[in-house]
């Protein structure tokens, strides 16, 4: 008889999930040289322990514990770019700008980059059907409390000027609900970070509206006041010239506005 | 520039108490998670009590319901409150500071003796 198994809303672990992060953690320790005394086996022991035989319903930030703790990686304080929804342009920007990092330029943010997993209470089993939604089922499933966890404490570590490349497209250019919104904003640490940078990116190719008199730019920028941080604001017009600019910056046409 | 002095070590008897004090300065504590170390002599470090900066605890089984770590925010202290000490406690204690992506610091350690 088949055992019942519980059915999520969600997709489900991605395949070769195991193979997968340990693969990518072997890449990431042979690419940079910082992080070569990494144990990848420790590693991926340390992520399937905060997740395997527990509710996919009840992760708490102390099941990642142990990974934090392997995954140390400093940072420079001073290089972080956050990013809302434009994930994608934020990372070919980093690919370019070396010295400039995203989470998912980090280690831990690598391992788990667009991947799903959960498991099931009491047994050792991943999940590959199914696994809870955020919205549908609930907020403390491994992959959202993995990305709050790794979140937070990558703001926690910010300093000095911290970018945060938002998507000018959305109709929530700043939305709260976001895991910025929510978490990021709430963890950059007053003490240590000077200014919070937006950078707008504009869509359409004839765009030229200040993105940054958006309202929820400026509910934005009230929040981060509030929290003793200035604020200030680029409208990114040319997406495509921008990366350009950034990969050749003594090109003749990178002097006017981008 | 980071620092973590740690004081309160000293010799004891047996059955005695101590509490140690990690007085941290250069960071931001409250993100930190912070552990108690010890080291004896011949003996590899290890993890006797840690503290997340969320308040979580977790505990080295030959120490549970004996030592009991606790942190102060606001002061930027850590404390190790250690009772019914043993002569196996004896060893250099060390104060660790932790962020997975703002580095770790370690203090110059404090030696506990107990001895009758």
């Known amino acids: 008889v088949p055992r019942w198994r519980q059915q999520w809303s969600g997709p489900g672990t991605t395949k070769r999930f195991p193979e997968t992060v340990l693969a990518r953690c072997v890449k990431y320790t042979e690419i940079h040289p910082e992080m070569r005394h990494v144990d990848c086996q420790s590693v991926w022991d340390a992520f399937k322990g905060a997740f395997i035989s527990k509710h996919p319903c009840n992760i708490t930030e102390e099941d990642y514990q142990p990974l934090m703790k392997l995954g140390t990686q400093t940072v420079p304080c001073n290089k972080i770019l956050l990013w809302s929804r434009i994930k994608d342009l934020a990372h070919q920007f980093t690919q370019v700008q070396r010295d400039m990092f995203t989470l998912e330029d980090t280690l831990l943010g690598y391992l788990a980059d667009d991947l799903t997993w959960c498991g099931e209470f009491n047994t050792s089993k991943i999940n590959y059907q199914s696994c809870p939604d955020w919205r549908k089922d609930c907020s403390n499933n491994p992959v959202s409390v993995f990305w709050k966890t790794v979140s937070r404490r990558f703001a926690e570590a910010a300093c000095d000027v911290v970018h945060v490349m938002l998507n000018g497209s959305r109709s929530k250019i700043f939305d709260k609900n976001s895991t910025f919104g929510s978490v990021e904003v709430h963890n950059l640490q007053p003490e240590k970070v000077q200014t919070l940078e937006a950078w707008v990116i504009h869509g359409g190719r004839e765009d030229s509206r200040d993105l940054c008199q958006d309202p929820t730019i400026k509910e934005l920028e009230s929040i981060i006041s509030k929290r003793n941080i200035q604020f200030s604001c680029k409208n990114i017009y040319r997406p495509d010239k921008f990366l350009q600019c950034v990969k050749n910056p003594e090109d003749s046409s990178c002097t006017s506005e981008i | 520039q980071v620092q973590l002095q740690e004081s309160g070590g000293g010799l004891v008897q047996p059955g005695g108490s101590l509490r140690l004090s990690c007085a941290a300065s250069g960071i931001i504590l409250r993100i930190y998670d912070m552990g108690w170390y010890r080291q004896a002599p011949g003996k590899q470090r290890e993890l006797v009590a840690e503290i997340t900066s969320g308040g979580s605890t977790n505990y080295a089984d030959s120490v549970k319901g004996r030592f009991t770590i606790s942190r102060d925010n606001a002061e930027n202290t850590v404390s190790l409150q250690m009772n019914s000490l043993k002569p196996g406690d004896t060893a250099v204690y060390y104060c660790?500071?932790?962020?997975?992506?703002?580095?770790?610091?370690w203090g110059q350690g404090t030696q506990v003796t107990v001895s009758s």
């Open positions: 660790n500071a932790h962020h997975t992506f703002a580095g770790a610091y």
